[in-house]
Interface confidence: low
């Protein structure tokens, strides 16, 4: 997260760290007791490493009573996701067992009504992604409030040049932005999960390259079918 600040500890109990061989790789969001939603591209970077999900964390390194690392029983990328595109960049991870819920671990309601978030709406994005262009990684969860950007502006040739489909949304990226390592994390508007940070190699913090988020409402049928 660029230009953000440290989050209040355990105030986002839905927040997950998708890890490979014990290292944070991507963000994720607990959407059901046994399911974490993340970005499909995150798996590409996992290679053959052991994928696990950390829940109930604020600090990645420090012991915390609510922290628990879960093995992944099943990884389900969206069937139309491709390595060379950010389209359908969603991944559902089934935990080896139902998460132990509590004040620091709780699923987040996700948007089912397929309607664009009003441009200008302030939404919260959180993650353990880099906090500087130099690539500094935080130990504790960071977050930032970002205004939703309308699709017409986001699709300008100087911005994302028509790449933003109706199944995506954008948020402003003027110095405050999601970045590498935040992919798969939640964009939360009004207490509801609206978007998932896409995992392209986008430049961060440049207002001409807004953050791109996959709209979960557009994939309600797929999410429901996997969770069923």
């Amino acid at each position: 997260i660029l230009g953000g600040r440290e989050a209040e500890a355990h105030a986002r109990p839905y927040m997950a760290s998708v890890q490979v061989n014990g290292e944070h790789l991507c963000g994720g969001v607990l959407v059901a007791e046994q399911w974490v939603l993340s970005a499909a591209h995150c798996l590409e970077d996992a290679a053959d490493g052991k994928v696990q999900v950390l829940l109930g964390a604020h600090s990645l390194s420090q012991p915390e009573p609510s922290k628990r690392l879960y093995d992944v029983l099943r990884a389900v990328p969206h069937p139309d996701s491709r390595p060379d595109t950010i389209d359908h960049d969603l991944l559902l991870l089934q935990l080896s067992e139902k998460a132990t819920l509590g004040p620091a671990v709780r699923p987040l309601p996700w948007q089912r009504v397929d309607r664009d978030v009003e441009p200008g709406t302030l939404c919260d994005v959180a993650g353990w992604g880099i906090v500087s262009h130099a690539g500094r990684r935080p130990d504790r969860l960071q977050h930032v409030l970002l205004p939703v950007l309308d699709r017409a502006t986001c699709n300008r040739r100087t911005h994302h040049d028509g790449a933003i489909t109706q199944r995506m949304m954008c948020a402003e990226s003027n110095r405050r932005d999601s970045c590498k390592g935040d992919s798969g994390g939640p964009l939360v508007c009004g207490g509801v999960l609206e978007g998932v940070v896409t995992s392209g190699s986008r430049v961060c913090g440049n207002r001409k390259k807004p953050g791109i988020y996959t709209r979960v409402a557009s994939y309600a049928a797929w999410i429901d079918s996997v969770l069923a």
């Epitope: 441009p119 309308d150 699709r151 017409a152 502006t153 699709n155 300008r156 040739r157 100087t158 040049d161 028509g162 933003i164 109706q166 001409k208």
Partner: antibody, heavy 114, light 108 residues
Framework: EVLLQQSGPELVKPGASVKIPCKAS????????IDWVKQSHGKSLEWIGD????????NYNQKFKGKATLTVDKSSSTAYMELRSLTSEDTAVYYC???????WGQGTLVTVSA | QIVLTQSPAFMSASPGEKVTLTCSAS???????LYWYQQKPGSSPKLWIY???NLASGVPGRFSGSGSGTSYSLTISSMEAEDAASYFC?????????FGAGTKLELK
């Protein structure tokens, strides 16, 4: 296929107004801004302004403030440009464009003559 | 506003000849926002080159664009009959976006 359909030529009297439609098809109307450009006979192009169909936000070229009014009708995926208090200086072809100038309408010739 | 000056205003070229059109800006423009259009009589302008050097869809590979700062150019490596047209440069680094007066390119 992205199409921007403009109306046919207009012959108008000095002092009158004209409203030029630009009907968009082949893409989601709210996904791109609509730009308007003027081309006087045998001359270069002048940017008039642009409008964001999502929220009606408009940028005008200062030169055309008071002369041009840009609007959109989302329900019909149509952008409009109204030109008022017309003089012979306003005789020109007017184009709408979208996708940051990747797509243009066929142009509407406005002739101002008594 | 930024003034774009194109030269030459008129040019005649033989088939196979290399052609270079230039566009000079009154102040520095971002290469991301420097475009070129081709226009033939009675037709709308067509986006030809965007962001200084990127060819628009369907534009032949004999066209190229380059430049930075205040100096930009469009080059045709080998002139063909279908390239005869007017070419306009365009910037939108700053508002209002502006266009050059154009270069009319004829086949000799």
């Amino acid at each position: 296929e992205v199409l921007l359909q403009q109306s046919g030529p207009e012959l108008v009297k000095p002092g009158a107004s004209v409203k030029i439609p630009c009907k968009a098809s082949g893409y989601t109307f709210t996904d791109y801004n609509i730009d308007w450009v003027k081309q006087s006979h045998g001359k270069s192009l002048e940017w008039i302004g642009d409008i964001n169909p999502n929220n009606g936000g408009i940028n005008y070229n200062q030169k055309f403030k008071g002369k041009a009014t840009l609007t959109v009708d989302k329900s019909s995926s149509t952008a409009y440009m109204e030109l008022r208090s017309l003089t012979s200086e306003d005789t020109a072809v007017y184009y709408c464009g979208t996708g940051d100038y990747a797509y243009w309408g066929q142009g509407t010739l406005v002739t101002v003559s008594a | 506003q930024i003034v774009l000056t194109q030269s030459p205003a008129f040019m005649s070229a033989s088939p196979g000849e290399k052609v270079t059109l230039t566009c000079s800006a009154s102040s520095s423009v971002s290469s991301s926002y420097l475009y070129w259009y081709q226009q033939k009589p009675g037709s709308s302008p067509k986006l030809w080159i965007y962001s200084t050097s990127n060819l628009a869809s369907g534009v032949p590979g004999r066209f190229s664009g380059s430049g930075s700062g205040t100096s930009y150019s469009l080059t045709i490596s080998s002139m063909e009959a279908e390239d005869a047209a007017s070419y306009f440069c365009h910037q939108w680094t700053s508002y209002p976006p502006t266009f050059g007066a154009g270069t009319k390119l004829e086949l000799k």
